[in-house]
């Protein structure tokens, strides 16, 4: 269930846009980047799609938002909320947040200047 964001500005417009786009490729891209560091010794590729493909799909989805700069933080917060119960230790949480904050730059968007990813009712 989506939390109440209570952000200033036209947050309802952003929330509608974030609801409309498919964030799964972004979630998959970030998880794959995190897992990549753990899989160096493994001979199996546990992913169905390469991370670069997922990154492109992620960027395409984020580009669907009308005002990328204003709504980007909401999208990043939603990704964090969707995945935070998958992350069980301090390093994983921090690494996920770092990868998440790098996402706009990877997509050639301007990163939100202030974006609090400590969301999800304190779960992350």
């Amino acid at each position: 269930m989506r939390r109440e964001r209570g952000r200033q500005g036209d947050s309802s417009s952003c929330e509608r846009q974030v609801d409309r786009v498919n964030l799964k490729p972004c979630e998959q891209h970030i998880m794959q980047r995190i897992m990549g560091e753990q899989e160096q010794y493994d001979s199996y590729d546990i992913r169905s799609t390469r991370s670069s493909d997922q990154q492109q799909r992620c960027c395409d989805e984020l580009n669907e938002m009308e005002n990328t700069q204003r709504c980007m933080c909401e999208a990043l917060q939603q990704i964090m909320e969707n995945q935070c119960d998958r992350l069980q230790d301090r390093q994983m949480v921090q690494q996920f947040k770092r990868e998440l904050m790098n996402l706009p730059q990877q997509c050639n968007f301007r990163a939100p200047q202030r974006c609090d990813l400590d969301v999800s009712g304190g779960r992350c």
Partner: antibody, heavy 117, light 111 residues
């Protein structure tokens, strides 16, 4: 890198017991921890989980309201307080480290809890 | 709650021969992040369990390459290409999608 459980023993039905797990060789405060048990001759059963910062604690339904998981990060120790013990709680209790991604990558040797009159 | 069902429950094997164990979940273990939250553990006689496979098909550090995991959604398989004497024990699958639940275990021993 190891986990060493202690505190097991024989207790009567309705009694209490507190298990401890001493962690070493890794930064205990950064990891989620679990308790998993195994009744004699039976399979594995996950019992409880505590997040690295204690924000979340989860339990299997059969122990909810009776068992409490806690941790002391300054002592690198995990605990399981077991109250209102029943015969079906008889098992070897394993202390287990979470990988950070929900799989278990380090197990202790276990401590035996016997609930019997 | 997610229920995990393994088969067979007992598997007599011949050293050098392949072996496989099936694990089925009552609901899909595929998360939106693209990973199957299904792990395999081996408990050798008199020992604590040890991790073999995580996320359905990712072999844990130090695990011999004769072990492999496959499957997605609700159906998973653990394969051993050539069983060795040291592989005897009880194999468990475990779901980690919602809380954590183990299968009943499959006892593997030498014929």
């Amino acid at each position: 890198v190891q986990l060493v459980e202690s505190g097991g023993g024989v207790v009567q039905p309705g009694g209490s017991l507190r298990l401890s797990c001493a962690a070493s060789g890794f930064t205990f405060r950064d990891y989620g921890m679990h308790w998993v048990r195994q009744a004699p001759g039976k399979g594995l059963e996950w019992v409880a989980f505590i997040r690295y910062d204690e924000r979340n604690k989860y339990y299997v339904d059969s122990v909810k309201g009776r068992f409490t998981v806690s941790r002391d990060n300054s002592k690198s120790t995990l605990y399981l307080q077991m109250n209102s013990l029943r015969a079906e709680d008889t098992a070897v209790y394993y202390c287990v480290k979470d990988s950070g991604l929900r799989y278990f990558n380090l197990w202790g040797r276990g401590t035996l809890v016997t609930v019997s009159s | 709650d997610i229920v995990m069902t393994q088969s067979p429950l007992s598997l007599p094997v011949t050293p050098g021969e392949p072996a496989s164990i099936s694990c089925r979940s009552s609901q899909s273990l595929l998360h939106s992040n693209g990973y199957n939250y299904l792990d395999w553990y081996l408990q050798k006689p008199g020992q604590s369990p040890q991790l073999l496979i995580y996320f359905g098909s990712n072999r844990a550090s130090g695990v011999p390459d004769r072990f492999s995991g496959s499957g997605s959604g609700t159906d998973f398989t653990l394969n051993i290409t050539r069983v060795e004497a040291e592989d005897v024990g009880v194999y468990y699958c475990m779901q980690a999608l919602q809380s954590w639940t183990f299968g009943q275990g499959t006892k593997v021993d030498i014929k």
